[in-house]
C-alpha cells in the first residue's frame, strides 16, 4: 500500500526583503511524488526552484524537498503543492515567525 | 475602473512579425499576472502566454513556443506579445485577460475588447 | 500538454430541460485548478464555476458543476433562455494552461 507524505512548510531570512521557502515532504511511499511551488495558483517556473532528491529516510518510506526564494510580504501569493499516489494538496507558506506547518494527508 | 485596451492588430504576411500591446489602467498593474488568449473567427477559446506579476514565471502554449515572446512593463502598465514566423492558423482575435487573485482562488477576471490579427498573402 | 476535451460540441435544449455537458482531460486534473467559463456571442468570457463545483458571484443556483480527476461536468438544473451561450473549461493544474474545445448550447 502507500504512505501519505508529511508535508512541512519553512521559511527563512535570505537577503534583505527576501526569504527563502523550503516545502519537505517524508515519510511517504512509494517514492513518485510530484512536489512544487505555486505563485497565483500557476507552478513556478523550474529554473527559480530548487529540488533534492527523492532520499530513502531509514523507515523503508522516502522525503524529498523544494526550495524557492520569494518578496518578504508576498507570501500569501505563494502555495507548495504536493500530489502523491492519487492524492494531492496545497500548503501555504506561514506568516511571520511561525516556522513549522505539518500536515499529514490520508 | 478596470480597463485592458489591446492595440497592434492588422494584416500580416506568413511569415512576418507583430508586436501586440496591452494598455492597462483602473488597477495596479505590476500586481497582477497577465495572459494572452486567443479566438479564431468562429473557434473556441486558445490560451496564449502567461507572464506572472513580477516576470518571474512564463508559460507558453506549445503551438507559439519558439515564436511568441510574452514581456510587459510595469512602470507603463503595458504588455506586450511579440510575433514572429507567423502563420495562417495564428489569425484570430487576441485578448489580454487579467489574472486575479481572490480568497486563494485564481481566474481571468477582466479581459480586454481584443485586437484582430490576420495572417494572409 | 493536457488536451481537454468537451461534449457534445453543440447541444440544443428546451426551457425548463436538464442539461449536462462533459470536460475530459488526457491526465489527471486537481479540481482546485479546473474552472468553468461562459461566453457569448461579442462578449468576453466569464468565470462561471470555479475550482470544479464553485458558482462564480452571481451564477445562478440552477446550474452545478462536479468531477474529479479526468473527468468534469457542468450541469444546469433547468434550461433558461438567458443560459444559451458556449462553456469552456479551463485548467491550469499543469503548464502550459489550457482551455476545453469548448460546448455551445442553444435553446430548442
Known amino acids: 500500500g502507500s504512505v501519505p507524505p508529511m508535508v512541512n512548510v519553512t521559511r527563512s531570512e535570505a537577503s534583505e526583503g527576501n526569504i527563502t521557502v523550503t516545502c519537505r515532504a517524508s515519510s511517504f511511499y512509494p517514492r513518485n511524488i510530484t512536489l512544487t511551488w505555486r505563485q497565483d495558483g500557476v507552478s513556478l517556473s523550474h529554473d527559480t526552484q530548487q529540488w533534492g532528491d527523492v532520499l530513502p529516510d531509514g523507515n523503508g518510506t522516502y522525503q524529498t524537498w523544494v526550495a524557492t526564494r520569494i518578496c518578504q510580504g508576498e507570501e500569501q501569493r505563494f502555495t507548495c503543492y504536493m500530489e502523491h499516489s492519487g492524492n494531492h494538496s496545497t500548503h501555504p507558506v506561514p506568516s511571520g515567525n511561525s516556522h513549522h506547518h505539518h500536515h499529514h494527508h490520508h | 475602473d478596470v480597463q485592458l485596451v489591446e492595440s497592434g492588430g492588422g494584416l500580416v504576411q506568413p511569415g512576418g512579425s507583430r508586436k501586440l500591446s496591452c494598455a492597462a489602467s483602473?488597477?495596479?498593474?505590476?500586481?497582477?499576472?497577465i495572459h494572452w488568449v486567443r479566438q479564431a473567427p468562429e473557434k473556441g477559446l486558445e490560451w496564449v502566454a502567461y507572464?506572472?506579476?513580477?516576470?518571474?514565471?512564463?508559460y507558453y502554449a506549445d503551438t507559439v513556443k519558439g515564436r511568441f515572446t510574452i514581456s510587459r512593463d510595469n512602470p507603463k502598465n503595458t504588455l506586450f506579445l511579440q510575433m514572429t514566423s507567423l502563420r495562417s492558423e495564428d489569425t484570430a482575435m487576441y485578448y489580454c485577460?487579467?489574472?486575479?487573485?481572490?480568497?486563494?482562488?485564481?481566474?481571468?477576471?477582466?479581459w480586454g475588447q481584443g485586437t484582430t490579427l490576420t495572417v494572409s498573402s | 500538454q493536457i488536451v481537454l476535451t468537451q461534449s457534445p460540441a453543440i447541444m440544443s435544449a428546451s426551457l425548463g430541460e436538464r442539461v449536462t455537458m462533459t470536460c475530459t482531460a488526457t491526465?489527471?486534473?486537481?479540481?482546485?485548478?479546473l474552472h468553468w467559463y461562459q461566453q457569448k456571442p461579442g462578449s468576453s468570457p466569464k468565470l462561471w464555476i470555479y475550482s470544479s463545483s464553485n458558482l462564480a458571484s452571481g451564477v445562478p443556483a440552477r446550474f452545478s458543476g462536479s468531477g474529479s480527476g479526468t473527468s468534469y461536468s457542468l450541469t444546469i438544473g433547468s434550461m433558461e433562455a438567458e443560459d444559451a451561450a458556449t462553456y469552456y473549461c479551463?485548467?491550469?493544474?499543469?503548464?502550459?494552461?489550457?482551455f476545453g474545445t469548448g460546448t455551445k448550447v442553444e435553446i430548442k
Open positions: 479551463h485548467q491550469f493544474h499543469r503548464s502550459p494552461l489550457t
Open positions: 507572464i506572472s506579476y513580477d516576470s518571474r514565471t512564463i
Open positions: 491526465s489527471g486534473v486537481s479540481s482546485s485548478y
Open positions: 485577460a487579467r489574472w486575479a487573485y481572490e480568497g486563494g482562488v485564481n481566474y481571468f477576471d477582466n
Open positions: 483602473g488597477f495596479t498593474f505590476s500586481t497582477f499576472g
